[in-house]
């Protein structure tokens, strides 16, 4: 029951996280104009990964896409790539995890298969969350660098010219959405990985009798059958044959057809 709850909660948390990553990627407020000490109040500018928007004092708002690829900073392209990779991995992870959910029955899918799928989706969610966090952090670092460069330019002047009045940009709402969403996706992925361990059926010992006919002496031994999940070392249901009184965890040998009476 706890495993099902952990898996279900991991799925829901990851779903919210990935929805947040998609929302952040599409948002226009990745950077917003810093209003402090800015003499220009007629316009307020905010920018996203895909377009720039201006809200004017008249209330009129206009947005324009960045129609050039070559003119954009490599860092912006890297952030775009990280966010898209995060979304794609998260979407695939969601798809896989739906089929892996313990509460959903699909054909005669074994628990071992569900456990594998849960682990796969969990890893995908973790990588997706890390991509989003990395993307947002790279963008934030770019803003901080740009902010201090602009501040320096304001007071020292650019290229020997007189003081430059340059618009500075600060963190927009999308950065916080991205960080939280990436964190949720990461947590959801960890929960899925934890759930995977509980989904893997434990090896169960069945009491049985096996015997090994070696010459004239016959030795009987209890606990001869071992059921396996496919996750342990004993990957096939093997009969354990023994000539002496050894424990079943010791070296095992495959039976031959002559061992059966």
């Amino acid at each position: 029951m706890a495993v099902t709850a952990c898996q279900g909660l991991g799925f829901v948390v990851s779903l919210i996280g990935i929805a947040g990553i998609i929302a952040a990627t599409c948002m226009d407020q990745w950077s917003t104009q810093d209003l402090y000490n800015n003499p220009v109040t007629a316009v307020f500018n905010y920018q996203g990964l895909w377009r720039s928007c201006v809200r004017e004092s008249s209330g009129f708002t206009e947005c324009r896409g960045y129609f050039t690829l070559l003119g954009l900073p490599a860092m912006l392209q890297a952030v775009r790539a990280l966010m898209i990779v995060g979304i794609v991995l998260g979407a695939i992870g969601l798809l896989v995890s739906i089929f892996a959910l313990k509460c959903i029955r699909i054909g005669s899918m074994e628990d071992s298969a569900k456990a594998n799928m849960t682990l796969t989706s969990g890893i995908m969610f973790i990588v997706s969350g890390l991509c989003a966090i990395a993307g947002v952090s790279v963008f934030a670092n770019m803003l901080v660098t740009n902010f201090w460069m602009s501040t320096a330019n304001m007071y020292t002047g650019m290229g020997g010219m007189v003081q430059t009045v340059q618009t500075r940009y600060t963190f927009g709402a999308a950065l916080f959405v991205g960080w939280v969403a990436g964190g949720l996706t990461l947590i959801g992925g960890v929960m899925m990985c934890i759930a995977c361990r509980g989904l893997a059926p434990e090896e169960t010992n069945y009491k049985a009798v096996s015997y090994h006919a070696s010459g004239h002496s016959v030795a009987y031994k209890p606990g001869g059958f071992k059921a396996s999940t496919g996750f342990g070392s004993n990957t096939k249901n093997k009969k354990i044959y023994d000539g002496g009184a050894r424990t079943e965890d010791e070296v095992q040998s495959y039976p031959s057809k002559h061992d059966y009476v």
């Epitope: 007629a42 720039s52 340059q166």
Partner: nanobody
């Protein structure tokens, strides 16, 4: 790259008028403002007036009611009509285009001298 060419500066008597113009050539990102800033010797650069691509206008406190800014989007040109000039309006007037492409860009003209004196 954007080049700005200013014209119209000169010597004028107090109470007189002058018209500055600034033509921008090159590729300018669609969202922007064009405007005028001035810098008197020993002081910081201050806002005179700006006209945005969307039609909004803003004036600096010291020139409100005396100066008028206009903009021709088709020609990428901005004009500053200065009236009732005072000696304190003496400064180098700089044309500025600020584009709102990614993280913004500022382009500046070389400046034109305006001297208000008897």
């Amino acid at each position: 790259q954007v080049q700005l060419v200013e014209s119209g500066g000169g010597l004028v008597q107090p109470g007189g008028s002058l018209r500055l113009s600034c033509a921008a050539s090159g590729s300018i990102f669609g969202l922007n403002f064009m405007g005028w800033w001035r810098q008197a010797p020993g002081s910081q650069r201050e806002l005179v007036a700006i006209a945005t691509s969307g039609g909004s206008i803003q004036y600096g406190d010291s020139v409100k009611g005396r100066f008028t800014i206009s903009r021709d989007n088709a020609k990428n040109t901005v004009y500053l009509q200065m009236a009732s000039l005072k000696p304190e309006d003496t400064a180098v007037y700089y044309c500025n285009v600020h584009t709102y492409d990614f993280l913004g860009r500022d382009y500046w003209g070389q400046g034109t001298q305006v001297t208000v004196s008897l």
